[in-house]
C-alpha cells in the first residue's frame, strides 16, 4: 500500500528572465526513492537517479540547472515556461509518486510564490 | 582522447566468481558514471548496473542484484565489476560504458571482456 | 521493467536505399532514447541519444525521432560501411533496457 505524499512549492509564479526552483518532498513513507523525473507536460527536463546523478534533457540542457537537492532550477524563463510541471518519484518499494508545479511567468515584475499543497 | 580498456578473457568454472577490470583514461574519471553491459552469444545488451564514482552510489538490475557487485578504484582510474555464483548462462562478452557528461547515454565502450562459465 | 520492442530484427536492402527501424517502448519513456550501432566482435558506438539528437562525428544520414512510446531510427542513403546491427535503449527509469536488435544487410 502507498502511504506518501509529496509536497510541492504548489502554484508559483516568476518574471520573464528570472529564475525558479522547482521543489518536491515525499513524506508518510519509508519507500527508498531511485530515482525522480521531472517532466513538463510531454517533455522530459531532467532525470535525477539516487546512485548515478544527473541526466539533463539537451533542449533544456542550457537554461536547467541541477539542484538544490533532488529539486531543479529552471533559467532564463520565457512566458513559453508558462504551464504544468510534475515531479515523479520512483520508489521501492511503493512504485511512483507524482506531484504538480504550476508555475506562470510574468511579463511583469509582480510576481509572488503560491502557498504549498499536498497531493496524496 | 578517451579509452576503457577492460582485463583479458576469463574461462571459469560454474560456481566461481570472476572479476574484470576496465581502466579509463583521457577524462576525469569521477565526472561520469560506469556501466556494466553484458551481451551473451546472439543476444541483446543487457544492463548489469552503474556506479557513481564521485560517491560510490551504485544501480544494479534486479536481476543482478546480490550476484554482481561494481567497486572504482579512483586512484587508478579504475572500475571493478565482480560476478559470483557463476552458471552457463553468464557465458557473454562484458562491456564496461561510461555515461555522457549529464546525460545518461552510453559514450564511451570497452573492448568487451569474453567470460565463458564451463565445467 | 521497461520492455523496448525493435523491429524488423533483421533487414536487407540496397546500397542508396533509405532504411527505418522502429523501436516500441512498453510504457512513456519520453525522449529518453539512444541508438546504437554494433559491428560485429566489436563494442556498441553511440549514434543518436535522447531520441533525435546526432552524436559528435556521427554522419547526418543517421537521424531519429520520436517521443513517448514510439521511435523511428533512420539511415537516408545506406552504406556499405553501415552493416551492422543497430539497437535501441531506453534510460527513463532503471532497469536500463535495450531492444533486440536489428541486423543490416545489404541486397
Known amino acids: 500500500m502507498m502511504t506518501g505524499t509529496i509536497e510541492t512549492t504548489g502554484n508559483i509564479s516568476a518574471e520573464k528572465g528570472g529564475s525558479i526552483i522547482l521543489q518536491c518532498h515525499l513524506s508518510s513513507t519509508t519507500a527508498q526513492v531511485t530515482q525522480v523525473n521531472w517532466e513538463q507536460q510531454d517533455q522530459l527536463l531532467a532525470i535525477c537517479n539516487a546512485d548515478l546523478g544527473w541526466h539533463i534533457s539537451p533542449s533544456f540542457k542550457d537554461r536547467v540547472a541541477p539542484g538544490p537537492g533532488l529539486g531543479l532550477t529552471l533559467q532564463s524563463l520565457t512566458v513559453n515556461d508558462t504551464g504544468e510541471y510534475f515531479c515523479i518519484y520512483h520508489t521501492y518499494p511503493d512504485g511512483t509518486y507524482t506531484g504538480r508545479i504550476f508555475l506562470e511567468v510574468l511579463e511583469s515584475s509582480v510576481a509572488e510564490h503560491g502557498a504549498r499543497f499536498q497531493i496524496p | 582522447q578517451v579509452q576503457l580498456v577492460q582485463s583479458g578473457a576469463e574461462v571459469k568454472k560454474p560456481g566461481a566468481s570472476v572479476k574484470v577490470s576496465c581502466k579509463a583514461s583521457?577524462?576525469?574519471?569521477?565526472?561520469?558514471?560506469m556501466h556494466w553491459v553484458r551481451q551473451a552469444p546472439g543476444q541483446r545488451l543487457e544492463w548489469i548496473g552503474g556506479?557513481?564514482?564521485?560517491?560510490?552510489?551504485?544501480s544494479y538490475s534486479q536481476k543482478f542484484q546480490g550476484r554482481a557487485t561494481l567497486t572504482v578504484d579512483t586512484s587508478a582510474s579504475t572500475a571493478y565489476m565482480e560476478l559470483s555464483s557463476l552458471r552457463s548462462e553468464d557465458t557473454a562478452v562484458y562491456y564496461c560504458?561510461?555515461?555522457?557528461?549529464?546525460?545518461?547515454?552510453?559514450?564511451?565502450w570497452g573492448q568487451g571482456t569474453t567470460v565463458t562459465v564451463s565445467s | 521493467d521497461i520492455q523496448m520492442t525493435q523491429s524488423p530484427s533483421s533487414l536487407s536492402a540496397s546500397v542508396g536505399d533509405r532504411v527505418t527501424i522502429t523501436c516500441q517502448a512498453s510504457?512513456?519513456?519520453?525522449?529518453?532514447l539512444a541508438w546504437y550501432q554494433q559491428k560485429p566482435g566489436k563494442a556498441p558506438k553511440l549514434l543518436i541519444y535522447?531520441?533525435?539528437y546526432r552524436y559528435t562525428g556521427v554522419p547526418s544520414r543517421f537521424s531519429g525521432s520520436g517521443s513517448g512510446t514510439d521511435f523511428t531510427f533512420t539511415i537516408s542513403s545506406l552504406q556499405p560501411e553501415d552493416i551492422a546491427t543497430y539497437y535501441c535503449?531506453?534510460?527513463?527509469?532503471?532497469?536500463?533496457?535495450f531492444g533486440g536488435g536489428t541486423k543490416l544487410e545489404i541486397k
Open positions: 535522447s531520441a533525435s
Open positions: 583521457g577524462y576525469t574519471f569521477t565526472e561520469n558514471a
Open positions: 560504458t561510461r555515461s555522457s557528461y549529464y546525460r545518461y547515454d552510453l559514450d564511451y
Open positions: 556506479i557513481n564514482p564521485n560517491q560510490g552510489g551504485t
Open positions: 535503449h531506453q534510460h527513463y527509469t532503471t532497469p536500463w533496457t
Open positions: 510504457q512513456d519513456i519520453k525522449t529518453a
